[in-house]
């Protein structure tokens, strides 16, 4: 506990102090006090440096004094033999003696009191900034006018802090400009502008006379702006150092003015403006900018238009353009989107064809779509080559972004029929040799593909059974062979409406128009068991003269049987139509002149026997395309016969070409379309 | 018409083979399909196997896979079955039996051959 | 193979009745499945084919109906000639295979 004063004496004191003795005395006097320690007896052996007995006073780190020996007052009013004076409140006394003394010594009494120190002149730094007042135990400091004391008790600052400025425009100097501005002051000055503006801040390089910087480029005195987490400065030196105009893209701006305790010179002045906040004209590739500006400002509106093949991509939408507004803080609106190259996406598969996996699906990339070939071909020209356009679409020079479409090839078989091993009338054929062959178990009888929708057959075959079954792609008809062939669903028969329908249909004599259309449920894949027969054009290449020869299969009636399992076919050639009617009927149901002939009947056969029978009914008379000689056509139909192994008579497919051309696109599916 | 003659009934011994024979008339066997059907007595039908023409093989149901063949002769228009390590339960009525046409599975019945397996 | 479950084995039945015989497929044959009638002694005799087609000289009496796995072959009113065995069998690619038959006998 600190005491005002006290008492220390030596072991023993006035006796003679024992050997080997080490004693310490603690000090203590009350905070803002200093301790005068006097000595009024000293008598210890004495010794150089006091080595053997002395004792040791101390201050913190500092020995005051050593004392040994003895000594006497030169003062005959005062008995004080020694005396320390320190400044600060604590003090320490040690006492030591060594293991022997050579006479009698009686130690030492001393005597300490708490001192009034001056700690405005006792010590080398001045603890007040301005005015320094002492008094007992303590001192306090003081300002002159206009200053305050800063809350550390001892600097006296100006009140230059707190001003905020929030006018779109303003001044701001230094205490006192241009007088000596105040020492050790820190003023602070805040800018407070309305969102959307930076404070700009000019500086006239006159107007500025700070202290310099030190010898290590410290400024003792400095000016400090900051904005946000930007920093301008610390400035300081004669003649502003910086730019004279700061842009600090912030609306608000802190201004520090640090001075010490030395050097003052006139200070600064500044103005300040608030600027619509800029925004950079940023670099937005593949796009156009509107209005164009050298300088983008806060509350400015530009559209952004991409280039040709380039979109906006938000989401999942896709646009060509977009507005971007400058936005208080200095970035645009909208900074995330950008001018992307179209993507066109994967590209439709079409049917009957295929597309390549695209390397690239967008801008400029380029695809090409091809069909199944040889059942297959483009149809719709164009040449399949698309390239990603502007608008995100496929585009085709020729089809736009319609795509291509691949149809059958008509009248290609992809084995040619060979007349092989002799059979009476006929040959063995492969599917192959006739694709579009297609049999119907019900009654038993043939048709002919002319499309993927479409078979043509005899109007007598389907009279009876509007359903009928069929099936494509067999050289066999037994069950099993048709088990894995292609069944064909009806969806509807058209009959030509010129057949007239008869109530007993066995004795009929008119084929007059034996002709119609079975429209199928599903597409027919082609393939090589399975292609199309071309129908005929309309122009006179198309008429048949005598002689030409066509080919006829089916799975009708032969010598041996009633139905042949396999397909079988022959080459015939065309006969004037009174070839026909010069043949007896073999089992007349009416009289021989009943059975009507007319040019809607095209004559053939009667060489070597060879000839359509029973069974044959609907299947195709194939002749070859007079403009293109890989092609076949169907000139007729298998229609009726008035003997089998002589002449036939078939339907003149030619003559129906409008009423099947009709008839398909009405009736057609929007996909056909 | 078609019609299909069978050799005449067999006896014989477990682990011995039999060749049925079936001859048709009224065709020729080139244009047909012949498969063959046993009938165990009192049993129901079973299919052996086939041999088809449009593929040129032979097919043969995977019970009795090993231990069938089944040839022609086109020249004389005569199918042959033969069935090899006859066994006991290989007792049964053996038809040949001409595939039918659009749809219908069989056509001509031969008039069967009984085999009887017996020690 | 195709494993083919012929329902019921035996059927006793009367003159003039309903009658209708199941045949289930283990996958689907579409519609090639066929509907036999065996008489004792008698090679079969062919009555349905494609699952619902009357083949010609048999009594309209007879039907057949189904595709996929589930099939029926219905005797509308069973007549004395009637008695008999009746097999399915699938074919739509080999191996063949018949039902167990289904015996139908007079009550």
């Known amino acids: 506990e600190p005491t005002m004063y006290g008492e220390i004496l030596s072991p023993n004191y006035p006796q003679a102090y024992p050997s080997e003795v080490e004693k310490s005395w603690d000090i203590e006097v009350p905070e803002g006090y200093g301790i005068h320690l006097y000595f009024t007896h000293l008598d210890i052996e004495l010794s150089e440096n006091c080595a053997y007995d002395s004792v040791q006073i101390i201050s913190g780190d500092t020995e005051e004094g050593r004392l040994c020996g003895q000594r006497s007052s030169n003062n005959p009013h005062s008995p004080i033999v020694e005396e320390f004076q320190v400044p600060y409140n604590k003090l320490q006394v040690i006492f030591k003696s060594d293991f022997s003394n050579e006479e009698r010594f009686t130690g030492f009494a001393a005597y300490y009191v708490a001192t009034d120190i001056n700690e405005c002149t006792d010590f080398v730094d001045v603890p007040c900034s301005h005015f320094c007042n002492n008094f007992i135990g303590g001192y306090f400091c003081s300002c002159p006018p206009e200053y305050f004391l800063h809350d550390d008790m001892k600097n006296c600052g100006v009140n230059c802090s707190g001003d905020v400025f929030t006018a779109l425009i303003g001044e701001i100097a230094s205490p006192n400009y241009p007088k000596p501005y105040p020492e050790n002051s820190r003023c602070e000055y805040q800018i407070r502008l309305e969102k959307g503006f930076q404070v700009v801040v000019t500086l006239r390089r006159e107007d500025f006379d700070v202290e310099a910087a030190d010898s290590a480029g410290n400024c003792l005195d400095s000016l400090v702006f900051v904005a946000g987490d930007r920093q301008f400065g610390p400035y300081c030196g004669h003649g502003f150092p910086g730019p004279l105009n700061i842009e600090t893209k912030s609306n608000a701006l802190d201004i520090i003015f640090q001075t010490d305790l030395t050097g003052q010179k006139k200070g600064w002045k500044l103005r300040y403006h608030g600027d619509p906040m800029p925004c950079p004209k940023e670099d937005t590739p593949n796009s156009v900018w509107e209005p164009a500006k050298a300088k983008y400002v806060f509350r400015d509106v530009v559209q952004i238009t991409c280039l040709d093949g380039f979109e906006v991509v938000e989401g999942r939408v896709g646009a060509t353009s977009f507005y971007s507004t400058c936005q208080s803080n200095g970035k645009w609106s909208n900074s995330k989107l950008k001018c992307q190259p179209v993507d066109c996406g994967i590209p439709e598969s079409i049917e009957n064809g295929k597309v390549e996996d695209p390397e690239s699906t967008l801008f400029g990339s380029v695809i090409r779509y091809t069909c199944e070939e040889p059942y297959y071909y483009m149809e719709n020209g164009g040449g399949g080559e698309y390239h990603c356009a502007g608008n995100g679409s496929w585009v085709n020079e020729v089809l736009g972004p319609e795509l291509p479409k691949c149809v059958p090839v008509c009248g290609v078989p992809r084995e040619p029929f060979e007349e092989k091993q002799r059979i009476i009338g006929g040959s063995d054929a492969d599917i192959k040799n006739f694709p579009w062959q297609v049999f119907f178990d019900n009654p038993w009888a043939g048709g002919a593909l002319i499309n993927e929708y479409w078979v043509l057959t005899a109007a007598h075959v389907v009279e009876g059974n509007r359903e009928p079954t069929m099936y494509v792609g067999s050289t066999s008809v037994q069950t099993s062979r048709l088990a894995k062939s292609k069944m064909l669903t009806p969806e509807h028969v058209f009959i030509h409406p010129g057949w007239k329908l008869l109530e007993v249909p066995e004795g009929r004599t008119n084929f007059d128009n034996d002709i119609a259309l079975v429209r199928l449920k599903d597409p027919v894949k082609m393939g090589p068991t399975v292609s199309p027969i071309c129908l005929p054009g309309t122009s006179s290449d198309y008429n048949l003269m005598d002689g030409d020869l066509g080919l006829i299969s089916g799975w009708g009636r032969t010598e041996k049987r009633d139905r042949a399992v396999r397909l079988k076919a022959a080459r015939l050639p065309v006969a004037p139509l009174r070839k026909c009617k010069e043949v007896k009927v073999e089992k007349p149901t009416a009289d021989a002149e009943a059975y009507v002939f007319t040019p809607n009947m095209i004559c053939a056969g009667g060489e070597k026997g060879m000839d359509s029978c029973k069974g044959d009914s609907g299947g195709a008379f194939a002749v070859q395309d007079p403009n293109d000689k890989t092609k076949f056509y169907a000139a007729g139909l298998v229609s009726w016969g008035p003997q089998c192994g002589t002449y036939g008579l078939y339907t003149r497919v030619k003559n129906y070409v409008d009423w099947i051309m009709k008839t398909m696109q009405e009736n057609s599916t929007p996909r056909e379309d | 018409q078609v019609q299909l003659v069978q050799s005449g009934a067999e006896v014989k011994k477990p682990g011995a083979s039999v060749k049925v024979s079936c001859k048709v008339s009224?065709?020729?066997?080139?244009?047909?399909?012949m498969h063959w059907v046993r009938q165990a007595p009192g049993k129901g039908l079973e299919w052996m196997g086939t041999?088809?023409?449009?593929?040129?093989?032979?097919i043969y149901a995977q019970k009795f896979q090993g231990r069938v063949t089944m040839t022609e002769d086109t020249s004389t228009d005569t199918a042959y079955m033969e069935l090899s390590s006859l066994r006991s339960e290989d007792t049964a009525v053996y038809y040949c039996?001409?595939?039918?046409?659009?749809?219908?599975?069989?056509?001509?019945w031969g008039q069967g051959t009984l085999v009887t397996v017996s020690s | 193979d195709i494993q083919m479950t012929q329902s019921p084995s035996t059927l006793s039945a009367s003159v003039g009745d309903r009658v209708t015989i199941t045949c289930r497929a283990s996958?689907?044959?579409?519609?090639?499945l066929a509907w036999y009638q065996q008489k004792p002694g008698k090679a079969p005799k062919l009555l349905i084919y494609?699952?619902?087609s009357l083949e010609s000289g048999v009594p309209s009496r007879f039907s057949g109906s189904g595709s996929g796995t589930e099939f029926t072959l219905t005797i509308s009113s069973l007549q004395p000639d009637d008695f008999a065995t009746y097999y399915c069998?699938?074919?739509?690619?080999?191996?063949?295979?018949f039902g167990q038959g289904t015996k139908v006998e007079i009550k």
């Open positions: 069998v699938q074919y739509p690619s080999y191996s063949w295979t």
């Open positions: 041999f088809d023409p449009e593929e040129g093989e032979t």
């Open positions: 996958q689907s044959i579409s519609s090639w």
């Open positions: 009224g065709d020729t066997l080139t244009e047909l399909s």
């Open positions: 494609k699952a619902s």
């Open positions: 039996v001409t595939e039918g046409e659009a749809g219908r599975p069989f056509d001509a």
